[in-house]
Amino acid sequence: QGWQAFKNDATEIIPELGEYPEPPPELENNKTMNRAENGGRPPHHPFETKDVSEYSCRELHFTRYVTDGPCRSAKPVTELVCSGQCGPARLLPNAIGRGKWWRPSGPDFRCIPDRYRAQRVQLLCPGGEAPRARKVRLVASCKCKRLTRFHNQSELKDFGTEAARPQKGRKPRPRARSAKANQAELENAY
């Protein structure tokens, strides 16, 4: 459920990596090379603020091995994970205290994959079995995407269930993934 098979123009299926609200803890050799917010692009948001750090759609890199049954990639692949919030909810006046308060309604912005890349890998298998060529689909960049209540589900359908809108008044809590679930995401491919 965390990922869907993506059919490209080819005859092969590439598993699509889902959106990770937070980097999974079990990824090995975590290279948290946080690139510029939004991968060097200006944040996609309507809010006016001087503090860009409020809009932290980060591209984090992790390395891990691709597996397919007993076979494992000769080298680990570097996987980009979209992480962080895309900014505060809309800032609205508080009629009672004449102050300001954060209202969690209004347009919703999510840090989601923007572009993908296909990585060719070689899987080495035990027992003298011939190596296999495979292709995995990896996130190439992330972006803040505006989601309204009318289309948020369809916009996110490609990125798994964890991207669903959080309950009102609650801080979104990333869903932990098991090592097995993570492993499945890079399996097979073409």
């Epitope: 092969e12 290279k31 980009l80 890349r117 011939a130």
Partner: antibody, heavy 119, light 111 residues
Framework: EVQLQQSGPELVKPGASVKISCKAS????????MHWVKQSPENSLEWIGE????????TYNQRFKGKATLTVDKSSSTAYMQLKSLTSEDSAVYYC????????????WGQGTSVTVSS | DIVLTQSPASLAVSLGQRATISCKAS??????????MNWYQQKPGQPPKLLIY???NLESGIPARFSGSGSGTDFTLNIHPVEEEDAATYYC?????????FGGGTKLELK
């Protein structure tokens, strides 16, 4: 030693089809993607597509969909490319080439097969 | 698709001098700190031959007078000192995104 041995030159009539072969040796055939590249004076080097010998799965350049069909025979470690409905624009040299992992590039090339389409 | 623009289309260099070939990509070919740009040499009647991979790595068996540099969208192939056997056409190719694409080629001639 890695080698990609391609079939000989072809002279074909417009509208006909041609099937080029590429026999691989010196490495595990199923472990590497095989790519095909077209070279014509007008268009420099053009990527046609790739095939995964392990699964038979293919990816094509949009421009060559319906024109090229890639297949493999694992038992003989041979990759094939069929070109159909040939026109003069298909006259070119065609290369099979292996995609390496380190280097992550087209590291070994066949000698090329010249296809001439003429009536 | 990523478009690669090579310049110049041709150049003539004296023996022992430096040849510099440029390749500009329509978008970045960087992924996780690696720049997926490769350089090939092709002589008449022969297939292309890999010289440089991931922007700056010299392929095994290639003389050290060949070097590659650059990142993001701008890349350079340098040959110094140029030798007679270097007369050929040189192509850049990106392997970051499918479909893989090639530059238009630069023909190097000796003066």
């Amino acid at each position: 030693e890695v080698q990609l041995q391609q079939s000989g030159p072809e002279l074909v009539k417009p509208g006909a089809s041609v099937k080029i072969s590429c026999k691989a040796s010196g490495y595990p055939f199923t472990g590497y993607f095989m790519h095909w590249v077209k070279q014509s004076p007008e268009n420099s080097l053009e990527w046609i597509g790739e095939i995964n010998p392990s699964t038979g799965g293919t990816t094509y350049n949009q421009r060559f969909k319906g024109k090229a069909t890639l297949t493999v025979d694992k038992s003989s470690s041979t990759a094939y490319m069929q070109l159909k409905s040939l026109t003069s624009e298909d006259s070119a040299v065609y290369y099979c080439t292996r995609w390496g992992y380190n280097p992550y590039a087209l590291d070994y090339w066949g000698q090329g097969t010249s296809v001439t389409v003429s009536s | 698709d990523i478009v690669l623009t090579q310049s110049p289309a041709s150049l003539a260099v004296s023996l022992g001098q430096r040849a510099t070939i440029s390749c500009k990509a329509s978008q970045s070919v960087d992924y996780a700190g690696d720049n997926y740009m490769n350089w090939y040499q092709q002589k008449p009647g022969q297939p292309p031959k890999l010289l440089i991979y991931t922007a700056s790595n010299l392929e095994s068996g290639i003389p050290a007078r060949f070097s590659g540099s650059g990142s993001g969208t701008d890349f350079t192939l340098n040959i110094h000192p140029v030798e007679e056997e270097d007369a050929a056409t040189y192509y850049c190719q990106q392997s970051n995104e499918d479909p893989p694409t090639f530059g238009g080629g630069t023909k190097l001639e000796l003066k």
